[in-house]
């Protein structure tokens, strides 16, 4: 348990700490418009926000990183907000033989933590 | 393959991009000195450095995040440097009945990527 306990309440105020946020993006934004057919508009959940001391720590390494950042901020970066899990997305691809269904297991974030 | 290819050469110059770095820390630094007996000094490998566009992208999500950060930098953060794998560490713990060996699978980073 590392005797350091992650916390879930944001000390910076609502919406400031690491959380999931939906960003709309078109296939043009992604540079995918010539080979993905549909959907043309994607709801991309992403992890945004700060990772203050012990907030949503991913694991022991993150807890330690937070502690050492407090001691050596120039040497050790603060933990940062990254996906903890993903939601699969199915896109229709243009292929030489027509159209295929392609699953992306790691495109849209489902949960976030501080790593 | 997402038609965006992660790259491994750092465009910012040597040592500036996401990489593994060893940080020395004492049990006192970690706040563990009353319950971990040995070792008293730890070599903690951590992930530090920047994640410029497409550098060491962890997965499709990270590639997309890098792309959208370029388009909407205020809305979408750049990917950040986090562990991709860990190396187990064994510590000697003080327990009620004496001393025990405890393995930490997620304490010391072994590799880094941009997520």
């Amino acid at each position: 348990s590392a005797h350091l306990h992650p916390r879930d309440s944001c000390p910076l105020g609502p919406g400031r700490c690491c959380h999931l946020e939906t960003v709309q993006a078109t296939l043009e934004d992604l540079g995918w418009s010539d080979w993905v057919l549909s959907p043309r508009q994607l709801q991309l959940s992403m992890c945004v926000g700060e990772c203050p001391h012990l907030y949503r720590s991913a694991n022991t390494h993150a807890l330690i990183k937070a502690r050492l950042h407090g001691l050596q901020p120039d040497r050790v970066p603060a933990p940062c907000c990254v996906p903890s899990s993903y939601t699969p997305v199915v896109l229709m691809h243009r292929t030489d033989s027509g159209v295929s269904l392609q699953t992306y297991d790691d495109l849209v974030a489902q949960g976030c933590h501080c790593a | 393959s997402a038609h965006l290819h992660p790259r491994d050469s750092c465009p910012l110059g040597p040592g500036r991009c996401c990489h593994l770095e060893t940080v020395q820390a004492t049990l006192e630094d970690l706040g563990w000195s009353d319950w971990v007996l040995s070792p008293r000094q730890l070599q903690l490998s951590m992930c530090v450095g920047e994640c410029p566009h497409l550098y060491r992208s962890a997965n499709t999500h990270a590639l997309i995040k890098a792309r959208l950060h370029g388009l909407q930098p205020d809305r979408v953060p750049a990917p950040c440097c986090v562990p991709s794998s860990y190396t187990p560490v064994v510590l000697m713990h003080r327990t009620d009945s004496g001393v025990s060996l405890q393995t930490y699978d997620d304490l010391v980073a072994q590799g880094c990527h941009c997520a």
Partner: antibody, heavy 118, light 107 residues
């Protein structure tokens, strides 16, 4: 909100053709594709094919290949499904369904009953 | 094509009881599976996608599990409005295919 409104019931003779329409609203029509699914009376659901409203690319169920044509009219945000050489076993409720990035779809038309009878 | 087999064909359950519906794929569909509920005269309603993610507005008593070839839809405590036909659907490969359905009826 997303709505798919289909044309009314049709009665056709064997050998004839039917064209069912599906008018979309509540979203940008060209951003998503349309699936067509049918259901014979008292039976299960059968997937017929898919069309992307943006480019008109299609993918049809093999058993219907040559008899089915799916089209879209982007000016009216309407998708069409035409089935030719109708047989009695084509009697079914035909549904249009908007695709989503998650595979399953909550967006279904109300259904159009096509009866094939001599 | 991938054949989806649902069992049982009919399930008789009392209100308040748990219902467990099964869906088997003839080959792996990963987690690319959805569950729909259909009542007479209505279009199907999406309950679950991605094998286990509840669609917007779907009550917590509905849950999905499984991956690969074996999937389960569980209704933890049947309400009167839950008596209907349930279909599974795979969208891992063309052609998209549905199971034959399970009718959940009042015991």
């Amino acid at each position: 909100q997303v709505q798919l409104v289909q044309s009314g019931a049709e009665v056709k003779k064997p050998g004839a053709s039917v064209k069912v329409s599906c008018k979309a609203s509540g979203y940008t029509f060209t951003d998503y594709g349309i699936f067509w699914v049918r259901q014979a009376p008292g039976q299960g659901l059968e997937w017929m094919g898919w069309i992307t409203a943006y480019s008109g690319d299609t993918h049809y169920a093999q058993k219907l290949q040559g008899r089915v044509t799916m089209t879209t009219d982007t000016s009216t945000s309407t998708a069409y499904m035409e089935l030719r050489s109708l047989r009695s076993d084509d009697t079914a409720v035909y549904y249009c369904v908007r695709d989503t990035q998650y595979g399953g779809s909550p967006y279904w038309g109300q259904g159009t009953l096509v009866t094939v009878s001599s | 094509e991938i054949v989806m087999t649902q069992s049982p064909a009919t399930l008789s359950v009392s209100p308040g009881e748990r219902a467990t519906l099964s869906c088997r794929a003839s080959q792996s569909v990963s987690s690319n599976l959805a569950w729909y509920q259909q009542k007479p005269g209505q279009a199907p309603r999406l309950l679950i996608y991605g094998a286990s993610t509840r669609a917007t507005g779907i009550p917590a008593r509905f849950s999905g599990s499984g991956s690969g070839t074996e999937f389960t839809l569980t209704i933890s405590s049947l309400q009167s409005e839950d008596f209907a036909v349930y279909y599974c659907q795979q969208y891992n490969n063309w052609p998209i295919t549905f199971g034959g359905g399970t009718k959940v009826e009042i015991k």
